[in-house]
C-alpha cells in the first residue's frame, strides 16, 4: 500500500524529502478550512471533522523536512499541485493559496519569504 | 520478510527500569513512523508511545509520560522504550509496530506487528 | 483526549450471522484517522481497516466499515469460524492516538 518509496537522487534533497512525506492531511486541513460547511470532501467527510486532526498530522509531516525555505516551499507547491484540480474556481483558488501560505505559522514553521504557487500550467 | 521482533522484557520490581528493544528487518525503516503499544493481561490494547521518521516528532500516553522514553537508531534499524519508575499498572504485553499510510488517499494505520515482549512489574 | 466507546463489550453470535460492531467517539474523528484491528487470542494485532472504510490487504469483503463524526461502525456481512475474536478500533489523528476497549465476538 505505501510507496515504493521515492524519486531518484540525493536522499538530503528536498525532493526526495516532499516525496516521504504525507502531505494529505496538509491537504485535507487546508480544504476543510475553505470549506467549511460545504459538501463532502473526496472519501472523507470534513464536515463534522475537528480540524485539529488533520493540522496536527499535517505538522507533524511537515516538520519530517529540514526546516529550510526551498524545502517548505517545494511542499507548499505540492500540496497545490495536488489539489489544484479540485478548485472549483478562482476564488477557491486565492483562498487556497492563502491558507496554504499561513501553514508553516500554523505549524510555527518559519514561512518561505518567495514561494511561488503558481503551478499546473498557470491554472492554479 | 517483513518482520519486527521484541526484546527486553522480564520481571522488575516496582521503581525499577527496564529497556525494551524492536528489532525491524524485511523494509526500509527510515521511512517509517513507529509505535509501542501495550496490553495488560485480559485486558485491551493501549497505545503508548510513537516516533516519527526523523524522530523530531515524538508522542506519549498520559499514564507514561515522563517515565518512558522512545528512541530509534535507522542505522541500526531497531526501536526502543526506556521505561523508568515502573508500577505494577505497567505489567503488559509490549508490541512494537509500524506505521504506514495510504498513499493515494493519506490514512494511517499500523500494518505490521510484533509478537510481543511480557513486561512483570511486581515486587 | 479522545476516548473512543465500543459496544457491545460481547457480541454471541452463529456463524453465518451478521455482526455489527459499534464505535463512539467523545470528540469527532476525521474517517481518514480511524482504524479496526482483529485480535485473536496469544496473536498480536491485525490490521483490518483504516480510512474508516477501506479495508486493508487481503482482508475478505464480507467486512466492511462506515461512519463518520462520532459515530462507526464495522459490519460482517456472513461470520466465518476464523471471524471469532475481539475487534478494536482506534483513532490515530490526535495524540494520544486511543484504542477503544474492545468488542469480543463469540460464538453462540
Known amino acids: 500500500m505505501r510507496r515504493e518509496r521515492g524519486r531518484q537522487g540525493d536522499s538530503s534533497s528536498c525532493e526526495r524529502q516532499v516525496d516521504r512525506v504525507n502531505l494529505k492531511p496538509c491537504e485535507q486541513h487546508i480544504m476543510q478550512r475553505i470549506m467549511g460547511e460545504q459538501e463532502q470532501y473526496d472519501s472523507y467527510d470534513i464536515r463534522s471533522t475537528r480540524s485539529s486532526d488533520q493540522q496536527q498530522r499535517c505538522c507533524d509531516e511537515l516538520n519530517e523536512m529540514e526546516n529550510t525555505q526551498r524545502c517548505m516551499c517545494e511542499a507548499l507547491q505540492q500540496i497545490m499541485e495536488n489539489q489544484c484540480d479540485r478548485l472549483q474556481d478562482r476564488q477557491m483558488v486565492q483562498q487556497f493559496k492563502r491558507e496554504l501560505m499561513n501553514l508553516p505559522q500554523q505549524c510555527n514553521f518559519r514561512a518561505p519569504q518567495r514561494c511561488d504557487l503558481d503551478v499546473s500550467g498557470g491554472r492554479c | 520478510e517483513v518482520q519486527l521482533v521484541e526484546s527486553g522484557g522480564g520481571l522488575v520490581k516496582p521503581g525499577g527500569s527496564l529497556r525494551l528493544s524492536c528489532a525491524a528487518s524485511?523494509?526500509?525503516?527510515?521511512?517509517?513512523?513507529m509505535n509501542w503499544v501495550r496490553q495488560a493481561p485480559g485486558k485491551g490494547l493501549e497505545w503508548v508511545s510513537s516516533i516519527t521518521r526523523s524522530s523530531r516528532t515524538i508522542y506519549y500516553a498520559d499514564s507514561v509520560k515522563g517515565r518512558f522514553t522512545i528512541s530509534r537508531d535507522n542505522a541500526k534499524n531497531s526501536l526502543h522504550l526506556q521505561m523508568n519508575s515502573l508500577r505494577d499498572a505497567d505489567t503488559a504485553v509490549y508490541y512494537c509496530a509500524r506505521e504506514d499510510f495510504d498513499v493515494s488517499t493519506g490514512p494511517y494505520y499500523m500494518d505490521v506487528w510484533g509478537n510481543g515482549t511480557t513486561v512483570i512489574v511486581s515486587s | 483526549e479522545i476516548v473512543l466507546t465500543q459496544s457491545p463489550g460481547t457480541l454471541s453470535l452463529s456463524p453465518g450471522e451478521r455482526a455489527t460492531l459499534s464505535c463512539r467517539a467523545s470528540q469527532s474523528v476525521s474517517n481518514m484517522f480511524l482504524v479496526w484491528y482483529q485480535q485473536k487470542p496469544g496473536q498480536a494485532p491485525r490490521l483490518l481497516m483504516y480510512g474508516a472504510s477501506t479495508r486493508a490487504t487481503d482482508i475478505p469483503d464480507r467486512f466492511s466499515g462506515s461512519g463518520s463524526g462520532t459515530d462507526f461502525t464495522l459490519t460482517i456481512s456472513r461470520l466465518e469460524p476464523e471471524d471469532f475474536a475481539v475487534y478494536y478500533c482506534?483513532?490515530?489523528?490526535?495524540?494520544?492516538?486511543?484504542f477503544g476497549q474492545g468488542t469480543k465476538l463469540e460464538i453462540k
Open positions: 482506534q483513532q490515530n489523528g490526535n495524540s494520544p492516538y486511543t
Open positions: 524485511g523494509f526500509i525503516f527510515s521511512d517509517y513512523n
